[in-house]
Interface confidence: low
C-alpha cells in the first residue's frame, strides 16, 4: 500500500557548479526495513519493463557502490528512517529531478526531489524591514537558499563598499523543512545613510568573492536644515535689515511645511524659506530657527542669536 510511505525533505534544493548539495530527508515505510535503495537522476517509468530508467547515481550496497565517476554521491541514510543524501561536488548537469527508489519487502516507492544547479554562485537576497527610520534599530537580513556541510561559505555586509563595523549573526539551517544560510545585522541608521548602498557579499571559506546582492537604503528622516543669516555675525543696529535663509540639505519623504520660530514661538505668516526682517527693533533680538516638517515629523535648524543694538 503505497500510501504508507511518508517522506519529509525540502521540495527543491539549490546549488551551483562545483559546490555541493546536502539533502536532509526522512521517511517511513510502515511494513518494515528498506531492502533496496537506488538514487536516479531524471527517472522515467518504462511501461514495457515496469521499471524506472535513468542515470543511477547510487545503489544500496554498503559503501554506496556506484559507477566509478559517481562516487561523489553519498547516501547517508539507513534502512528505516533516514534518507539524507550528499552530492559533492555538484555539477550543472545534476539539475533536474532526483528519484529515490525505495523498496521494502512488500512495497515500492519513488520519491522525487528537485535539484537546481546554476552555472555560477547565485546571489543572496537582502531583506529589509518595510520602513527604516533614522536612529531606530533595524535588522538587515541576508538570505541564501544554500547550505552544505562540505562547502563552507560566509556572508559579509558592506556599506558603500566598506565592511560594516556592526557584528552580524550568521545561522544555517539544514533540516527537512528548509536549507539556507542567513546573516542578520542589527543597525541603527542615521539620516546620512539615506541613499547609501548596502551589500551582502557571498564569499567562500577563503574570503573569495562569489556573488552579492545590493540595496539602496531608504532611511526615513525629518528634514535636515541649515540656516544662514545676513549679516553673518547676526549683530545689527536698530533700523537695519536682516535676512535669514533656511536650506533643506535632506528630507525623506519630501517636506510639506515651513515655519520660523523666535524663542521657541512660531512667527505668524512666515512660511517661506527666507525670513526678511526690515528695520529691526530692539525687541526683535532673540533666538531664531527655521522648522520644516515632513510625514516623519518636524526638523529644526540650529538657532541663530540675533542681537539688535541701539543705533
Amino acid at each position: 500500500d503505497s500510501s504508507k510511505w511518508v517522506f519529509e525533505h525540502p521540495e527543491t534544493l539549490y546549488a551551483w557548479e562545483g559546490a555541493c548539495v546536502w539533502i536532509p530527508c526522512t521517511y517511513r515505510a510502515l511494513d518494515g526495513d528498506l531492502e533496496s535503495f537506488i538514487l536516479f537522476h531524471n527517472p522515467e517509468y518504462n511501461k514495457n519493463t515496469s521499471k524506472f530508467d535513468g542515470t543511477r547515481l547510487y545503489e544500496s550496497t554498503k559503501d554506496g557502490k556506484v559507477p566509478s565517476e559517481q562516487k561523489r554521491v553519498q547516501f547517508l541514510g539507513d534502512k528505516n528512517k533516514n534518507c539524507t543524501l550528499s552530492i559533492h561536488p555538484v555539477h550543472l548537469n545534476d539539475s533536474g529531478q532526483l528519484g529515490l527508489r525505495m523498496e521494502s519487502k512488500t512495497e515500492k516507492w519513488m520519491e522525487r526531489i528537485h535539484l537546481n544547479v546554476s552555472e555560477r554562485p547565485f546571489p543572496p537576497h537582502i531583506q529589509l524591514p518595510p520602513e527604516i527610520q533614522e536612529s531606530q534599530e533595524v535588522t538587515l537580513t541576508c538570505l541564501l537558499n544554500f547550505s552544505c556541510y562540505g562547502y563552507p561559505i560566509q556572508l559579509q555586509w558592506l556599506l558603500e563598499g566598506v565592511p560594516m563595523r556592526q557584528a552580524a549573526v550568521t545561522s544555517t539551517s539544514l533540516t527537512i523543512k528548509s536549507v539556507f544560510t542567513r546573516s542578520e545585522l542589527k543597525f541603527s541608521p542615521q539620516w546620512s545613510h539615506h541613499g547609501k548602498i548596502v551589500t551582502c557579499q557571498l564569499q567562500d571559506a577563503d574570503g573569495k568573492f562569489l556573488s552579492n546582492d545590493t540595496v539602496q537604503l531608504n532611511v526615513k528622516h525629518t528634514p535636515k536644515l541649515e540656516i544662514k543669516v545676513t549679516p553673518s555675525d547676526a549683530i545689527v543696529r536698530e533700523g537695519d535689515s536682516v535676512t535669514m535663509t533656511c536650506e533643506v540639505s535632506s528630507s525623506n519623504p519630501e517636506y510639506t511645511t515651513v515655519s520660523w520660530l523666535k524663542d521657541g514661538t512660531s512667527l505668524k505668516k512666515q512660511n517661506t524659506f527666507t525670513l526678511n526682517l526690515r528695520e529691526v527693533t530692539k525687541d526683535q533680538s532673540g533666538k531664531y530657527c527655521c522648522q520644516v516638517s515632513n510625514d516623519v515629523g518636524p526638523g529644526r535648524s540650529e538657532e541663530v542669536f540675533l542681537q539688535v543694538q541701539y543705533a
Epitope: 533496496s36 545503489e59 547517508l76
Partner: antibody
C-alpha cells in the same frame, strides 16, 4: 535461489599460476560486490579482496596485491581469481562470497569452496 | 591493518550452557557513514561459513534467537543463550568497516 559455485582448484607447483572461477546465479550479478576469502588447512578465514562486477572496481588485502588479480565477466555472471607466483603457504580452500547487496555489509551467500594445493 | 582478536580460542561447553565469545579490534571499526560493520560467522568442518550476526547486533534471517551480538567501539560479544547440539562449530568475528577487511582467528566451541 542465489547460488555461487567455485571451480578451478587443484594441484599446482610453487611459482605456478591458477585461475579460479565463481559462477553466480539467482540474482543481478553486476550489482553486488563479490569477495574472495581463503582458509588454509586447519587455520582461520582470510579476506583476499573483492570486485564490483558492474564497473570492475576492486579492493585487495595488501598481502595479495600484485600476485592476485580479481576480475569479472558480467556476460557470464562469473568472477575470477587469478593467482600467480604461487607459494606453499597459498595452499587453502578458496571461497567466493557475495556482499548482501545492501548498506548492511555482510557475506550472505558463500560458495562451497575449491581447494588449491601448492606443492612440488 | 586492523587486528581482530577473539577469546577464548576454544571452549568446552554442554548443551543448554550460556556461551560468550568476545572479539576485540585493535582500533575503532566505526565506518565513515557511522555504522559499525562487525559480523559473526559460524563454520562447521568441511563447510562454508554461515552468517549469524551483522552490524554488531542484527540477526540474519533464519538465525535462531538464541544467538545475539552486542558491543561498540572496539569490544564485541557473541552470546549463545542456550547451547544446542548443532551449535558446536567454530565462530569468527569479521570487520568490514576499513580496508583490508579482517577476520578474528576463530573460537572453537566443543562438546564437554
Amino acid at each position: 535461489e542465489v547460488q555461487l559455485v567455485e571451480s578451478g582448484g587443484g594441484l599446482v607447483q610453487p611459482g605456478g599460476s591458477l585461475r579460479l572461477s565463481c559462477a553466480a546465479s539467482g540474482y543481478e550479478f553486476s550489482r553486488s560486490w563479490m569477495n574472495w576469502v581463503r582458509q588454509a588447512p586447519g587455520k582461520g578465514l582470510e579476506w583476499v579482496g573483492r570486485i564490483y562486477p558492474g564497473d570492475g572496481d576492486t579492493n585487495y588485502s595488501g598481502k595479495f596485491k600484485g600476485r592476485f588479480t580479481i576480475s569479472a565477466d558480467t556476460s557470464k555472471n562469473t568472477a575470477y581469481l587469478q593467482m600467480n607466483s604461487l607459494r606453499a603457504e597459498d595452499t587453502a580452500v578458496y571461497y567466493c562470497a557475495r556482499d548482501g547487496s545492501s548498506w548492511d555489509w555482510y557475506f550472505d551467500v558463500w560458495g562451497q569452496g575449491t581447494l588449491v594445493t601448492v606443492s612440488s | 591493518d586492523i587486528q581482530m582478536t577473539q577469546s577464548p580460542s576454544s571452549l568446552s561447553a554442554s548443551v543448554g550452557d550460556r556461551v560468550t565469545i568476545t572479539c576485540r579490534s585493535s582500533q575503532s571499526i566505526v565506518h565513515s557513514n557511522g555504522n559499525t560493520f562487525l559480523e559473526w560467522y559460524q563454520q562447521k568442518p568441511g563447510k562454508a561459513p554461515k552468517l549469524l550476526i551483522y552490524k554488531v547486533s542484527n540477526r540474519f534471517s533464519g538465525v535462531p534467537s538464541r544467538f545475539s551480538g552486542s558491543g561498540s567501539g572496539t569490544d564485541f560479544t557473541l552470546t549463545i543463550s542456550s547451547l544446542q547440539p548443532e551449535d558446536f562449530a567454530t565462530y569468527y568475528c569479521f570487520q568490514g568497516s576499513q580496508f583490508p577487511y579482517t577476520f578474528g582467528q576463530g573460537t572453537k566451541v566443543e562438546i564437554k
